[in-house]
């Protein structure tokens, strides 16, 4: 069956979000110690559940801490300045979850490193893209 235009738009937005998150992860994985070691000391909150677009609220709430860690890195590995990268992500997240959402994010008890955090959200995006295909 043909995919609806709204579904295609959602897929493209998720692809864009994935691209930005993978860019960050790639940039981080390119670091040589001790910068990476220092970045891994920062803790991020993980969603208790992330299976629907509304759960992107949990990602949105962690974008400021993410920007702060990326600023600390001061690296050219990200292709864009951290502020622009996070701005891109924020715009896409708002479009995907809807600005009217009043969803209250529930976080897991355990915090995560920046690498674990990014992996979680990349997995989330890929999973939803797959279900929409």
């Amino acid at each position: 069956a043909p995919t609806s235009s709204s579904t295609k738009k959602t897929q493209l937005q998720l692809e864009h979000l994935l691209l930005d998150l993978q860019m960050i992860l790639n940039g981080i994985n390119n670091y040589k110690n001790p910068k990476l070691t220092r970045m891994l000391t920062f803790k991020f909150y993980m969603p208790k559940k992330a299976t629907e677009l509304k759960h992107l609220q949990c990602l949105e709430e962690e974008l400021k801490p993410l920007e702060e860690v990326l600023n600390l890195a001061q690296s050219k590995n990200f292709h864009l300045r951290p502020r622009d990268l996070i701005s891109n992500i924020n715009v896409i997240v708002l479009e995907l979850k809807g600005s009217e959402t009043t969803f209250m994010c529930e976080y897991a008890d355990e915090t995560a490193t920046i690498v674990e955090f990014l992996n979680r959200w990349i997995t989330f995006c890929q999973s939803i893209i797959s279900t929409l295909t």
Epitope: E15, L18, L19, Q22, M23, L25, N26, N29, N119, I122, T123, Q126, T133
Partner: nanobody, 118 residues
């Protein structure tokens, strides 16, 4: 060292056409999701077109009906055919290739400049 190499950019008149190519090494071609995004000065980066490993395509509304993304598996190359070009299509165009499973490796090229003059 894995590389993606874009070519085909240049100066074109409004309404004209260009075909961008993205040559890759085979290790990052088959099965990977690939696409084109563009960056114009002072503007948000825009994802223009995507093609999955299975050949499914998707386009930004701004280029739908004018741009066509395709991939040639025998040449490990991806293309972006751009028709009916407009001044607002002026940007640096980057191709990328990404893994769809962990460790989520991402590769992108150096970019090729497309200038559409009126």
């Amino acid at each position: 060292q894995v590389q993606l190499l874009e070519s085909g950019g240049g100066l074109v008149q409004t309404g004209g056409s260009l075909r961008l190519s993205c040559a890759t090494s085979g290790t990052i071609f088959s099965g990977y999701t690939m696409g084109w995004y563009r960056q114009a000065p002072g503007k948000q980066r825009e994802l223009v077109a995507v093609i999955s490993g299975g050949g499914d395509t998707n386009y930004a509304d701004s280029v739908k009906g004018r741009f066509t993304i395709s991939r040639d598996n025998s040449k490990d190359t991806m293309y972006l055919q751009m028709n009916s070009l407009r001044a607002e299509d002026t940007a640096v165009y980057y191709c990328y290739s990404r893994e769809v499973t962990p460790p989520w490796k991402l590769y992108w090229g150096q970019g090729t400049l497309v200038t559409v003059s009126s």
